[in-house]
């Protein structure tokens, strides 16, 4: 004979010795019907705040308050947001490795410094874990056939450099 607890809906509990579906008491939930007990609702307070409230059929979901981020499955811990020069990993905030940077507060990943030489430019300012490299103007390499003429432009004292 099928136990009548099997017909119980989520949001209820049922004991085998008295197979009657009963509503979960306040601050408890059951996402599966027919269980002998309802689960105690999660509470989101302190560094946590509610992303979802607990109902009779689902648990509360928490997130971290501003300036903090979640760690662990279902946001079990809150950790202070990463500073510029760091990135968030599974182990928490880690300093950017040499040659990478992150200029964002709380978010973002460490990105490689710009390679100035790819654009034919020199490094004007070296990068840090928080700031990218600053590239200088393009390096003009003069070949033997290059001629330079300075021509007046736009009135007295105005000159422009023309690379021919």
């Amino acid at each position: 004979v099928q136990n009548s607890c099997d017909n119980c809906q989520p949001g209820t509990f049922c004991r085998k010795y008295n197979p009657v579906c009963k509503s979960c008491p306040p601050s408890t939930f059951s996402s599966i019907g027919g269980q002998p007990n309802c689960n105690i609702c999660r509470v989101c307070a302190g560094y946590f705040r509610f992303k979802k409230f607990c109902s009779s059929t689902h648990n509360a979901e928490c997130e971290c308050i501003e300036g903090f981020h979640c760690l662990g499955p279902q946001c079990t811990r809150c950790e202070k947001d990463c500073r510029p020069g760091q990135e968030l990993t599974k182990q928490g905030c880690k300093t950017c490795s040499l040659g990478t940077f992150n200029d964002q507060n709380g978010t973002g990943v460490c990105r490689p410094w710009t390679n100035c030489s790819l654009d034919g430019r020199s490094v004007l300012k070296t990068g840090t874990t928080e700031k990218d490299v600053v590239c200088g103007p393009p390096v003009v390499s003069f070949s033997p056939s290059t001629t330079i003429s300075v021509t007046p432009e736009g009135g007295p004292g105005g000159h422009s450099l023309q690379v021919l």
Epitope: S27, T28, F50, K51, K52
Partner: antibody, heavy 114, light 106 residues
Framework: QVQLKCAGPGLVQPTQTLSLTCTVS????????VHWIRQPPGKGLEWMGI????????YFLSAIKSRLSISRDTSKSQVFLKINSLQTDDTAMYYC???????WGQGVMVTVSS | DIVLTQSPTTIAASPGEKVTITCRAS?????MYWYQQKSGASPKLWIY???KLASGVPNRFSGSGSGTSYSLAINTMETEDAATYYC?????????FGSGTKLEIK
């Protein structure tokens, strides 16, 4: 900055459907839920329900639940409240609020009368 | 549903006086939340997580309690504190409010 603006008709006839809109700015509906709360004239606050960041909803488990629906349009940053088969005791100030109740709309007064 | 019973319904206090409003829950809740509402205005979150003051709330206000018994206190009443105060629980839906306490100036 965070703002919620409620809009809807001031006067609705009994048995008709009430449609209210809450337009939010300063936060995303895909990150934060929005509540609807109402307050009959001279009375207390009654929580009606919430639409969550993922579109899921929770409603007040009372007689009104069967007449109530909350939905949203994330592209327009709007949350909607619909109540059908309106009764005179649905006359109230209707508010929307962000999930943490830290920001509330200015409210819209709805009178149900023929 | 968790029923919240506030007392008193109305209270009149003179400036400088200490005021206490209580909120009793029909079953245990983890934290209590309080709102202030002035006539013709939207409610404002006043106290959260039982005892934390919301942004801009003067520190003459305090909140305390646990289980089924909670309270909001004003150390020294000021005229601007005249308003209606509501308690609310977030432990489980439906989220319920107390019926309100109207605080008037004597």
């Amino acid at each position: 900055q965070v703002q919620l603006k409620c809009a809807g008709p001031g006067l609705v006839q009994p048995t008709q459907t009430l449609s209210l809109t809450c337009t939010v700015s300063g936060f995303s509906l895909t990150s934060d839920g929005v509540h609807w709360i109402r307050q009959p004239p001279g009375k207390g606050l009654e929580w009606m329900g919430i639409i969550y960041y993922d579109g899921g909803t929770d409603y007040f488990l009372s007689a009104i639940k069967s007449r109530l629906s909350i939905s949203r349009d994330t592209s327009k940053s709007q949350v909607f409240l619909k109540i059908n088969s309106l009764q005179t005791d649905d006359t109230a100030m209707y508010y929307c609020a962000r999930i943490h109740f830290d920001y509330w709309g200015q409210g819209v007064m709805v009178t149900v009368s023929s | 549903d968790i029923v919240l019973t506030q007392s008193p319904t109305t209270i009149a206090a003179s400036p400088g006086e200490k005021v206490t409003i209580t909120c009793r829950a029909s079953s245990s809740v983890s934290y209590m939340y309080w709102y202030q509402q002035k006539s013709g205005a939207s409610p404002k979150l006043w106290i959260y997580d039982t005892s934390k003051l919301a942004s801009g709330v003067p520190n003459r206000f305090s909140g305390s309690g646990s289980g089924t018994s909670y309270s909001l206190a004003i150390n020294t009443m000021e005229t601007e504190d005249a308003a209606t105060y509501y308690c609310q629980q977030w432990s489980s839906t439906p989220l319920t409010f107390g019926s309100g306490t109207k605080l008037e100036i004597k």
